[in-house]
Every structure is written in structure tokens, then in C-alpha cells.
């Protein structure tokens, strides 16, 4: 369980010519409110389909009256966040619709009148527990700036809110396969969905409490390797009692991938590699343009002004795929030598070297550094018969004993503000930019307003996403 939170920063005229008329006037004062509708996955459903993940209405904003002759400014907004609680797992990919509504406060018969000012929509990939994601969307001549995040409600944790935190059962450690619950280090993560003890490598579940075995494994917790000698076929789910494999269809049989996608089997199911212009679990989502926001993880969308011309996603470092949907596992190439630990920081690779080694890839042997201590996590580096300390982020000086200012080099582009942080630095980007160093402009989506629908919350069909 958890909460999706939406913070509206501004709603007003977009840049460029053709500024919209103010929605309110001295004769017709009005106030704004917002509605958000969430659907799981990358749905192509119509705006009127149920908000299966949930929906929320904001409070009404302050009353606004246009000043005669003045252009429409950013309009006064309601206080607070829009919060959409979700009961089950956070799906990771979701579609949203944000509607801006006007409530006219004149002397209408029968009370205030509502009308839809703008509707924006998009599809995003988002992990629960992550930082606020910023976005800008256009609807006609209007521009909406907002941030959003998904957070888990205790005791749920994890990127999908599918793990629970529980008090430790032993003072110094968590159970097998369970991690401490940051920041609650005195608690442990415990599986919520599958049967307790179900092997994380060889078991999975599609129903809470069960433990289904991957090919080649059996037993109540999928910890027993299958003996296939007496069996007919090496494929299919294992029988719990016999440990024998039963013939079954392969997940790629009949190619479930549409639109020319190619299918590859995964341990639990299948994965489609889609041609450009298509995506979704089975490559079934098509006719996508940059206005649909198809590039994930901060990818920049170029081209694709209409459904017939393909868009291209320029992916930030650390991501790949036609929609920047795949994280590049650059550590799998084992770039760190001499037993160094590889860390993929997204924007860069870092090797954490074992004692006695240094260099970007731990390629330098530092025998004469053996007795040399570099403070604060610094590494001693051999150089021309002498030694020096290569200091960790935030430290400097001969022995890394002096605090360095990681912001001194002005690393944040496009006017982003730099903050020193225990792990290095953090950039707070100026509006319109994103990325670890604010290097990517946010490409506006330009979705046009859709026909009005009456405000109010429609309950979604009951669905579980476990």
C-alpha cells in the first residue's frame, strides 16, 4: 500500500505567441481545482475509462478576478498535494490524466458552474520511494508544471511497496534473503506476497502466499533441484510431490509479440523486443508521438510530431532501449580490475578498489602505499616513486583530511543550484531542465485539451496489482 502524490507548481499561459484569455473576469470571478486520474501500466485507454489505480480532486483554489487589460498570469492554485492512495502494489509504469477545472462563481441559477480548462496526459515509469519527479505539460496555450512521486505506507517498502518491514527476530541480523529496512535499520524487510521462505532465485508467486517453482526446481519452497531422468520433457511447471517436470507450452510459443516484435524467454515469462514506434508488454502500443512522453528515465524525445513519423529517444547515461526503459548493467562487463567492486551510479561507473590498488579501474598496484593512510575513504595512489591520496567526494588535501566543496566547480548546468551532500553533490534544476547535472531540457508534451467530462471521482474496477 502507498500514496501517489502530485504537487501542482503552476498553471498559466505557455511561452510563445497566442496567450490565452484569462479564464476569469470581474463579472465572472472563478477559482481553479485539479483532478488526477491514474491507471496502471502504459494504457492507451480513453480518458473516460476507469481510473483503476485511483483518482483525486484537489481543494478549490483562491477566488481570482482578472485585472482589466492585464495578460493572463499564472493562476492562483489550491493549497496542498493531490494524494491518490493505492491499496496494493505500485505498478511501476502508469498513465496519468491531470485536468484543470474552472469553477465560475457568478450568480448562476443552481449554484456554481464547472468547465474543463485543460487536460494533459502522459505515461511514465516511476519507482516508489524515489525522489520527486518534475514535469511540464502543455495543453493548447496553457502550461502546467508539476511534480509527482509514489511513496509506500509503512510497513510496506520497496520500489513496488510489496515488501513489509517487521521487527528483527534476532538482534544482529535479518532472516535469509531479507535486508534491513532503511532507514529503519532495527527492522527487516520481509516478503509480503510469496510464501515465507520461498526461494528468491527459484520460486515466484502470482497469488499471495503461494510459492511456484521455476523450471528445474521443486519442493514447498522451490529449494529442491528436479531430477529429470524419469521425465518425458524438460519443460513446464514442476509437480510439487513427484519432482518430475510436466510438459507444457513455452512462453514464446506462437510469438505473443505484436507488430514485428521478437520474443525471448525469461525465467518467469517472456520479454518482447519491440521495433521503434511500438512498445508495451507485447509491443501492442502504437501510434506514439513525443506528445505521449514515451521516453523514460529522463530520455529526450526528438521527432515524431505525428503518428506516422517515428520518434527517437536520446537516453541519458546508464539507460538504453528504444524508450530508454532498460538500465544498462555496465558492471556486467567487469570493468574493475584486481577484485575491485563496481558501482553503477547512473551518470558514471565507479570502481571501489581493494586495499593496495587504485585508479579509475583499480589498475594500479600500490605496493609502496601499504603503510600510507588516506583519511575519509581516500585511496593512496602511486605516482613517480611518491604517493598521493585520491580523495573521496567531498574531501581534499594531501591526506584527504580537508573538507572540499563539491560545488566549487559549478557542476549544475542551465542555472541549476548545487547542494553539497554526504555522498557528493545534488543539483536542483531550474524549471525546464532535468538530469543529474540538469543537462537535459524537458521536452514539452503539447497534449491538446480533450472534450470535457464532468468532475468527480469514478471508482475504478476492483483490480489487484501484486
Amino acid at each position: 500500500a502507498g500514496v501517489f502524490e502530485l504537487q501542482i507548481h503552476s498553471f498559466g499561459p505557455g511561452p510563445g505567441p497566442g496567450a490565452p484569455r484569462s479564464p476569469c473576469s470581474a463579472r465572472l470571478p472563478c477559482r481553479l481545482f485539479f483532478r488526477v486520474c491514474l491507471k496502471p501500466g502504459l494504457s492507451e485507454e480513453a480518458a473516460e475509462s476507469p481510473c483503476a489505480l485511483g483518482a483525486a480532486l484537489s481543494a478549490r483554489g483562491p477566488v481570482y478576478t482578472e485585472q482589466p487589460g492585464a495578460p493572463a498570469p499564472d493562476l492562483p492554485l489550491p493549497d496542498g498535494l493531490l494524494q491518490v492512495p493505492f491499496r496494493d502494489a505500485w505498478p511501476g509504469t502508469f498513465s496519468f490524466i491531470i485536468e484543470t477545472w474552472r469553477e465560475e462563481l457568478g450568480d448562476q441559477i443552481g449554484g456554481p458552474a464547472w468547465s474543463l480548462l485543460a487536460r494533459v496526459a502522459g505515461r511514465r515509469r516511476l519507482a516508489a520511494g524515489g525522489p520527486w519527479a518534475r514535469d511540464i505539460q502543455r495543453a493548447g496555450a496553457w502550461e502546467l508544471r508539476f511534480s509527482y512521486r509514489a511513496r509506500c505506507e509503512p510497513p510496506a517498502v520497496g520500489t513496488a511497496c510489496t515488501r513489509l518491514c517487521r521487527p528483527r527476530s534476532a538482534p544482529s541480523r535479518c532472516g535469509p534473503g531479507l535486508r534491513p529496512c532503511a532507514p529503519l535499520e532495527d527492522e527487516c524487510e520481509a516478503p509480503l506476497v510469496c510464501r515465507a521462505g520461498c526461494s528468491p532465485e527459484h520460486g515466484f508467486c502470482e497469488q499471495p502466499g503461494e510459492c511456484r517453482c521455476l523450471e528445474g526446481w521443486t519442493g514447498p519452497l522451490c529449494t529442491v533441484p528436479v531430477s529429470t531422468s524419469s521425465c518425458l520433457s524438460p519443460r513446464g511447471p514442476s509437480s510439487a510431490t513427484t519432482g518430475c517436470l510436466v510438459p507444457g507450452p513455452g512462453p514464446c510459443d506462437g510469438n505473443p509479440c505484436a507488430n514485428g516484435g521478437s520474443c525471448s524467454e525469461t525465467p518467469r515469462s517472456f520479454e518482447c523486443t519491440c521495433p521503434r514506434g511500438f512498445y508495451g508488454l507485447r509491443c501492442e502500443v502504437s501510434g506514439v508521438t513525443c506528445a505521449d512522453g514515451p521516453c523514460f528515465n529522463g530520455g529526450l524525445c526528438v521527432g515524431g510530431a505525428d503518428p506516422d513519423s517515428a520518434y527517437i529517444c536520446h537516453c541519458p547515461p546508464g539507460f538504453q532501449g528504444s524508450n530508454c526503459e532498460k538500465r544498462v548493467d555496465r558492471c556486467s562487463l567487469q570493468p574493475c580490475r584486481n577484485g575491485g567492486l563496481c558501482l553503477d551510479l547512473g551518470h558514471a561507473l565507479r570502481c571501489r578498489c581493494r586495499a593496495g590498488f587504485a585508479g579509475p579501474r583499480c589498475e594500479h598496484d600500490l605496493d609502496d602505499c601499504a603503510g600510507r593512510a588516506c583519511a575519509n575513504g581516500g585511496t593512496c595512489v602511486e605516482g613517480g616513486g611518491a604517493h598521493r591520496c585520491s580523495c573521496a567526494l567531498g574531501f581534499g588535501g594531501r591526506d584527504c583530511r580537508e573538507r572540499a566543496d563539491p560545488c566549487a566547480a559549478r557542476p549544475c548546468a542551465h542555472g541549476g543550484r548545487c547542494y553539497a551532500h554526504f555522498s557528493g553533490l545534488v543539483c536542483a534544476c531550474a524549471p525546464g531542465y532535468m538530469g543529474a547535472r540538469c543537462e537535459f531540457p524537458v521536452h514539452p508534451d503539447g497534449a491538446s485539451a480533450l472534450p470535457a467530462a464532468p468532475p468527480g471521482l469514478r471508482p475504478g474496477d476492483p483490480q489487484r496489482y501484486l
Epitope: 513489509l164 517487521r166 527476530s169 532472516g175 535469509p176 520481509a190 516478503p191 510464501r195 515465507a196 521462505g197 497469488q207 499471495p208 502466499g209 503461494e210 519442493g219 514447498p220 519452497l221 529449494t223 529442491v224 510439487a240 510431490t241
Partner: antibody, heavy 118, light 107 residues
Framework: QVQLVQSGAEVKKPGASVKVSCKAS????????IEWVRQAPGQGLEWMGE????????VYNEKFKDRVTMTVDTSTSTAYMELRSLRSDDTAVYYC???????????WGQGTLVTVSS | DIQMTQSPSTLSASVGDRVTITCKAS??????VAWYQQKPGKAPKALIY???YRYSGVPSRFSGSGSGTEFTLTISSLQPDDFATYYC?????????FGQGTKLEIK
């Protein structure tokens, strides 16, 4: 806290059937296996089988599979174990237990004594 | 079926003693072993799971160890409440099986 409350003691004749109930409370009944274990007088524990209420999946001990049926009623969070063709050596205390959030039988019912006697 | 053999069958000890109960599996069960305590006329109570992890609320004097086929339950300093019968159980393979029990009595 989690509770499993079992039905009362039964006296049966050989060849008859017995149906023991186990009512669960204070947890999501569908999401955890219910285990059935019996203990003959002065003897050890013997596992009979299990059922996952969420989908009705059962696994029975081969020793009992021709005589036992495990069912659930999710509307009342109650599990049932029926044992047929009773014999005198089926005289035992029958326990239900819950496979909990850790890998073991975390919570147990108070037990139901079934006496088979002619 | 996997046999779980406990030893000793009966153990006499005094309050404050350190006692160890062993359990041998007839084949490899990894660490999929639990220990339970049972008092006369009562249902068993969970003590240890995954061979060495104490269940919540179980006092720290109880500890478990072992993997593969040999497992031990240790009570570091016996308390009056600890005199009971103890059972090991494997849940690596169906059917789940229990040891025959070890009765811990006052010397």
C-alpha cells in the same frame, strides 16, 4: 493478534467421518497456508497436509490422501479438515496451524481431540 | 519421506545448565528446518526457523545452528519455563516431517 480457534472434541465410531473446523482471525486469511498436524496420545507430531485459502490449492501427505479433504470458506475465514473411514489409530489431537510471515508453523489452534472407538 | 532423528529422546538437566539437542535429517534439507516447544496438553510453539533464526518473542537463550543434514537447538541457560518437549521439523520437501521429540526434564 493472530488466532486460530478449533471446533470441540468429537467421538466417532470406526468407519465414520469427522470434520474439524479452524476459524482464523486478525490476518489476511487468503494469503497464508493452513497446515493440519495430528498427534496421537503420547506420540510425536505428524503432518497431514496444507491448503492455501486464496486459491484452494492443497498438498496432502500421501499417507492420508485417499481419506482426507481440506477445504476453506473464505467468507468466514474458516478452514476445514475432513477425515473419512476412521480407524482406532486415528484417535489423536488434530491441530491447525498457519504458515506465517517466516518459514515455519507460526500460529497453532488449541487442538481438537478426536476419539475413534466402537 | 525424509526422516528427522532427534537425540537424545530424554534429557535431564538443571536450571542454569546449557543444553543441546541434535536433529539429523536422512537427506540434505539445506537450512529449511524449524524447532518447536510443546508443553503437556498444549499446542506446539514456534522457536526457530530457517535453522538459525529466532522467531519473534522467543528469548535469546534459544539458538539454532546447522545446515544440510545436522542441526542443533541450544538453550544457553535453562529456565524453569523451558522444561518441555522439543521437536525439529524439515520443510524442504513434501511431506513435512517432524523428529520424534526430545523430552527435557528436571534433574
Amino acid at each position: 493478534q493472530v488466532q486460530l480457534v478449533q471446533s470441540g472434541a468429537e467421538v466417532k465410531k470406526p468407519g465414520a467421518s469427522v470434520k474439524v473446523s479452524c476459524k482464523a482471525s486478525d490476518y489476511t486469511f487468503s494469503n497464508y497456508y493452513i497446515e493440519w498436524v495430528r498427534q496421537a496420545p503420547g506420540q510425536g507430531l505428524e503432518w497431514m497436509g496444507e491448503i492455501l485459502p486464496g486459491n484452494g490449492n492443497t498438498v496432502y501427505n500421501e499417507k492420508f490422501k485417499d481419506r482426507v479433504t481440506m477445504t476453506v470458506d473464505t467468507s468466514t475465514s474458516t478452514a476445514y479438515m475432513e477425515l473419512r473411514s476412521l480407524r482406532s489409530d486415528d484417535t489423536a489431537v488434530y491441530y491447525c496451524a498457519r504458515w506465517g510471515d517466516y518459514a515455519l508453523f507460526a500460529n497453532w489452534g488449541q487442538g481438537t481431540l478426536v476419539t475413534v472407538s466402537s | 519421506d525424509i526422516q528427522m532423528t532427534q537425540s537424545p529422546s530424554t534429557l535431564s538437566a538443571s536450571v542454569g545448565d546449557r543444553v543441546t539437542i541434535t536433529c539429523k535429517a536422512s537427506q540434505n534439507v539445506g537450512t529449511n528446518v524449524a524447532w518447536y516447544q510443546q508443553k503437556p496438553g498444549k499446542a506446539p510453539k514456534a522457536l526457530i526457523y530457517s535453522a538459525s533464526y529466532r522467531y519473534s518473542g522467543v528469548p535469546s537463550r534459544f539458538s539454532g545452528s546447522g545446515s544440510g543434514t545436522e542441526f542443533t537447538l541450544t538453550i544457553s541457560s535453562l529456565q524453569p519455563d523451558d522444561f518441555a518437549t522439543y521437536y525439529c521439523q524439515q520443510y524442504n520437501s513434501y511431506p513435512f516431517t517432524f523428529g520424534q521429540g526430545t523430552k527435557l526434564e528436571i534433574k
